[in-house]
């Protein structure tokens, strides 16, 4: 699926990749932080609320229907009303230590800044990506991944940690955002919605995708995560949107087929090593990049986010398996595990390609609203 006025590159294809340019230009809303499609109610970043993370309310789950279709890009722009009132997900909060504020969850109390003050920071993630406002940076070169094609042995730990499904990665997966910006992959995890409700963390022009994969990396300048937290560039996350396509994604099936084994919170299983790069789009040259934060407490800032322009395609059945298999805290389904988009507060998202240049006949001349800060690098 393509947004209106997309650039006419043909998809590269291969791997598990989907559309080459899902993140094209759409008519921009008039306000920088206007309400966005599928944002949790009460988190619309209204004027005067730019500094509030607002984690108190989450979407409530609509009654499930079998294989309810996810939103399609041609539906844009749409703003849906909140779902029918049902029991919110993950609200049965298992609080064994009484007033312990570290037991965060999606939706409801405790407010995340009470769990970790950094969650009230000014440069938080996720964000809404507006390609027309992105700064084209020719200095952003194709990402380099080395050692991501893992042999079957040693096996990897796949765990339901109550917030997501996480695959712990072995040493040796190297990633470079550019010269001198080298990282080691640590783990990957997913964010998703519920039946008929998308659950990506980042959005594009207010559009929320069915799901999103995050591959978390540690800068080679640090030996351990605790040293890197909050340091600019200490952590880097590669993010890709997952969309519905006609065919089963064989790479993802290696993980999704094991989810029943870890349905319970805290459970884990061992899975054979696989090609981690096959879980990402094939086009490493077209992406958006900005500095933000972890999207879960402690919400530490200084995280470099790289969001692929190309999506990954999964079958409807696979997306259903992802959103309908796992259980979280308090015997509640592990669903809608995404944070609301956070205000940019002056940040400029950079693009490795001219995402904001409007090449349609309606434009008198191409417009690029922001210039690249790294142009001289």
């Amino acid at each position: 699926q393509r947004l209106p006025r997309m650039q006419e590159d043909s998809p590269l294809g291969g791997g598990s990749s989907g559309e080459d340019d899902p993140l094209g230009e759409e008519d921009l809303p008039s306000e920088e932080d206007s309400p966005r499609e599928e944002d949790p109610p009460g988190e619309e970043d209204l004027p005067g609320e730019e500094d509030l993370p607002g984690e108190e309310d989450l979407p409530e789950v609509k009654p499930k229907s079998e294989e309810e279709g996810s939103l399609k890009l041609e539906d844009l722009p749409t703003v849906e009303a909140p779902g029918d009132p049902q029991e919110p997900q993950n609200n049965a909060h298992r609080d064994k230590e009484g007033d312990d504020q570290s037991h965060w969850r999606y939706g409801g109390d405790p407010p995340w800044p009470r769990v970790s003050p950094a969650c009230a920071g000014r440069f938080q993630s996720p964000v809404d990506i507006r390609p027309q406002l992105a700064a084209f940076c020719p200095a952003l070169r194709p990402l380099e991944l080395l050692g991501f094609q893992l042999p079957p042995l040693p096996e990897l730990r796949l765990r339901n940690n109550g917030h997501s499904v996480q695959l712990t990665l072995p040493p040796g997966l190297e990633m470079a955002l550019g010269p001198g910006r080298e990282y080691r992959a640590l783990q990957l995890h997913l964010h998703w919605g519920a039946a008929g409700r998308p659950g990506s963390e980042h959005t594009v022009e207010g559009h929320r995708f069915p799901a999103e994969i995050h591959v978390v990396h540690l800068s080679t300048a640090f030996a351990r995560v605790d040293e890197a937290l909050g340091r600019p560039g200490g952590l880097a996350v590669l993010a890709a949107f997952l969309e519905e396509g006609p065919e089963e994604n064989s790479a993802y099936e290696q993980l999704l087929s094991r989810l029943e084994e870890i349905a319970e919170e805290g459970s884990e299983t061992q899975v054979p090593g696989l090609d981690i790069s096959a879980l990402l789009p094939s086009d490493f040259s077209r992406y958006f990049q900005y500095e933000g934060s972890l999207t879960t407490p402690p919400c530490a800032q200084g995280v470099i986010w790289t969001v692929f322009n190309q999506t990954v395609m999964l079958s409807a059945k696979q997306l259903h398996t992802l959103s309908d298999t796992l259980w979280g805290p308090g015997d509640s389904r592990l669903q809608l595990n995404f944070r609301a988009t956070q205000p940019l507060n002056g940040r400029v998202i950079e693009a490795s390609f001219p995402a904001g240049v409007d090449s349609s006949p309606r434009a008198a001349e191409p417009v690029q609203l922001n210039s690249c800060l790294a142009a001289g690098d």
Epitope: R159, T168, Q187, L218, R224
Partner: nanobody, 117 residues
């Protein structure tokens, strides 16, 4: 630098009890509030196996071999994770390791538990 230190191991007779403790220390110790904490064990000549895990939300999971006998708990205020081991059996003999899973794995040095008469 964050460290995990296990304690409480020792020699105990079959049917007896032990309480293992894992304490996190270091500058960034507060990240362990957000970690899934687990106990693993490794017997001589065998692979390391999961014993019990407690998520950051307090959910617990046990291996079948210890279910009903072992209890994992955490005290985030004291940055400790406990493993109460009752009705110990000789096959529980192993080195027990504390693990914290927060973006990456942190491991303690291990504490020896020997169940023998």
């Amino acid at each position: 630098q964050v460290q995990l230190q296990e304690s409480g191991g020792g020699l105990v007779q079959p049917g007896g009890s032990l309480r293992l403790s894992c304490a996190a220390s270091g500058n960034s110790v507060n990240i362990f509030r957000f970690a899934a904490m687990a106990w693993y064990r490794q017997a001589p000549g065998k692979q390391r196996e999961l014993v019990a895990v407690i998520t950051s939300a307090g959910g617990t999971k046990y291996s079948d071999s210890v279910k009903g006998r072992f209890t994992i708990s955490r005290d985030n205020a004291k940055n400790t994770v406990l493993l109460q081991m009752n009705s110990l059996k000789p096959e529980d003999t192993a080195v027990y390791y504390c693990n914290a899973d927060y973006l990456q794995d942190y491991w303690g040095q291990g504490t020896q538990v020997t169940v023998s008469s």
